[in-house]
């Protein structure tokens, strides 16, 4: 029962995590204009992995996609790649884990096969979570570096009377969503790996055999041997769970900004 709960919880946590990674990847607020210690501007800038947006105080928002591939910073491309790899691995992990769930019966699938699939999906979730955390952290590091660089020369053209205010960017909501989502996926993966250990067949129970010695009424019953193979096939004692299959179809996609509102 504990194994089923651990596996189910691991699946749900990973599902929420991957939904969060997808949301973070699609979000436009990876970096937002730093408002602290800045003149009050009637324009608010924020940027995502795929496009940059400008929200005017008038209420109108304009978003522009990064239509170039070669002109983008290598770090941004790396972050995109990490997030996509995280999503792909997570999606495959989810698919595998659905079939690995103890509460779902598919044909005559062995417990050992389910254990293998649980471990596989667990590892996939761990890698997916790490990819997301790495992607978000790389972007955050890039922001910190740029922030201090732009702070160093906050005002350019100080020679004359004219000043140019440089827009500084700070952490956007997507970074926090990404960190939390990556962490959840990682935790879910660890839970799946723990569940895998419990799923592995532990006992091979042989039926007691009676040997009738002539003249004596002594029954010899050999004790059950502990199976140490871990993932060996256990065809004798299959347990059938008929718990309802839970489908989670509430994967949220982040509402996209409008090009012109």
């Amino acid at each position: 029962m504990a194994v089923t709960a651990c596996q189910g919880l691991g699946f749900v946590v990973s599902l929420i995590g991957i939904a969060g990674i997808i949301a973070a990847t699609c979000m436009d607020q990876w970096s937002t204009q730093d408002l602290y210690n800045n003149p009050v501007t009637a324009v608010f800038n924020y940027q995502g992995l795929w496009r940059s947006c400008v929200r005017e105080s008038s209420g109108f928002t304009e978003c522009r996609g990064y239509f170039t591939l070669l002109g983008l910073p290598a770090m941004l491309q790396a972050v995109r790649a990490l997030m996509i790899v995280g999503i792909v691995l997570g999606a495959i992990g989810l698919l595998v884990s659905i079939f690995a769930l103890k509460c779902i019966r598919i044909g005559s699938m062995e417990d050992s096969a389910k254990a293998n699939m649980t471990l596989t999906s667990g590892i996939m979730f761990i890698v997916s979570g790490l990819c997301a955390i790495a992607g978000v952290s790389v972007f955050a590091n890039m922001l910190v570096t740029n922030f201090w660089m732009s702070t160093a020369n906050m005002y350019t053209g100080m020679g004359g009377m004219v000043q140019t205010v440089q827009t500084r960017y700070t952490f956007g909501a997507a970074l926090f969503v990404g960190w939390v989502a990556g962490g959840l996926t990682l935790i879910g993966g660890v839970m799946m790996c723990i569940a895998c250990r419990g799923l592995a067949p532990e006992e091979t129970n042989y039926k007691a055999v009676s040997y009738h010695a002539s003249g004596h009424s002594v029954a010899y019953k050999p004790g059950g041997f502990k199976a140490s193979t871990g993932f060996g096939s256990n065809t004798k004692n299959k347990k059938i769970y008929d718990g309802g299959a839970r489908t989670e179809d509430e994967v949220q996609s982040y509402p996209s900004k409008h090009d012109y509102v």
């Epitope: 204009q33 003149p39 009050v40 501007t41 009637a42 324009v43 800038n45 940027q47 940059s52 947006c53 400008v54 005017e56 105080s57 008038s58 209420g59 109108f60 304009e62 522009r64 004219v162 000043q163 140019t164 205010v165 440089q166 827009t167």
Partner: antibody, heavy 118, light 113 residues
């Protein structure tokens, strides 16, 4: 058709109060940022106050901060400017204007004259 | 506060003439996020409320004749009327739409010779 009509102007004594109204038609004031702009006789334009579509933030010109209050009544589709502690330098035609693309003011009212004099 | 300086303060013209007026801001009005300049031009005829002509420094408002052209970037902006008509005689104001308070220039008065 978008229309803005100001009212509430008139002669006020220094230190007195006045509430200006701006009735909007053709659009809902709650969906747009709105402004009050004034123009002293034979002078240039001076921005006075701004209220965003969500009623926050609200900004005021330093010359009126603490004395003027911008607000709106969404059901009545009306913008207000409550003016207190009026001074002679507040004498002007007060316009309400709608915020638009590029943070520009695309529609203006005809204006209402406020005269602060003893 | 951002100071908007318009020049000249008045212009005496004849119909059909090309007119250019300048507006300078004390800080750049260029937003790096969308590479747009938050400067607006308005026209105000005597006894009337101002009318929007150009926003984003160069985008003409719908219904505005194409003889009106806005140009410039950063801190220096220009409004050009390619061929002045009698109905263009008015005061032209530029406005900073990037920083609060949203300051206006003193205006350029267009008069007939």
């Amino acid at each position: 058709d978008v229309q803005l009509v100001e009212s509430g102007g008139g002669l006020v004594q220094p230190g007195g109060s006045r509430k200006l109204s701006c009735a909007a038609s053709g659009f809902t004031v709650s969906s747009f940022g709105m402004h009050w702009v004034r123009q002293a006789p034979e002078k240039g334009l001076e921005w006075v106050a701004y209220i965003s579509s969500g009623s926050s933030p609200i900004y005021y010109a330093d010359t009126v901060k603490g004395r003027f209050t911008i607000s709106r009544d969404n059901p009545k589709n009306t913008l207000f400017l409550q003016m207190t502690s009026l001074r002679s330098e507040d004498t002007a035609i007060y316009f309400c204007a709608r915020f638009y693309y590029g943070n520009s003011f695309d529609h203006w009212g005809q204006g209402t004259l406020v005269t602060v004099s003893a | 506060d951002i100071v908007m300086t318009q020049s000249p303060s008045s212009l005496t013209v004849t119909t059909g003439e090309k007119v250019t007026m300048s507006c300078k801001s004390s800080q750049s009005l260029l937003n790096s996020g969308n590479q747009k300049n938050y400067l607006t031009w308005y026209q105000q005829k005597p006894g009337q409320s101002p009318k929007l002509l150009i926003y984003w420094a160069s985008t003409r408002e719908s219904g505005v004749p194409d003889r009106f052209t806005g140009s410039g970037s950063g801190t220096d902006f220009t409004l050009t009327i390619s061929s002045v008509q009698t109905e263009d005689l008015a005061v032209y104001f530029c406005q900073n739409n990037y920083f609060f308070p949203l300051t206006f220039g003193a205006g350029t008065k267009l008069e007939l010779k």
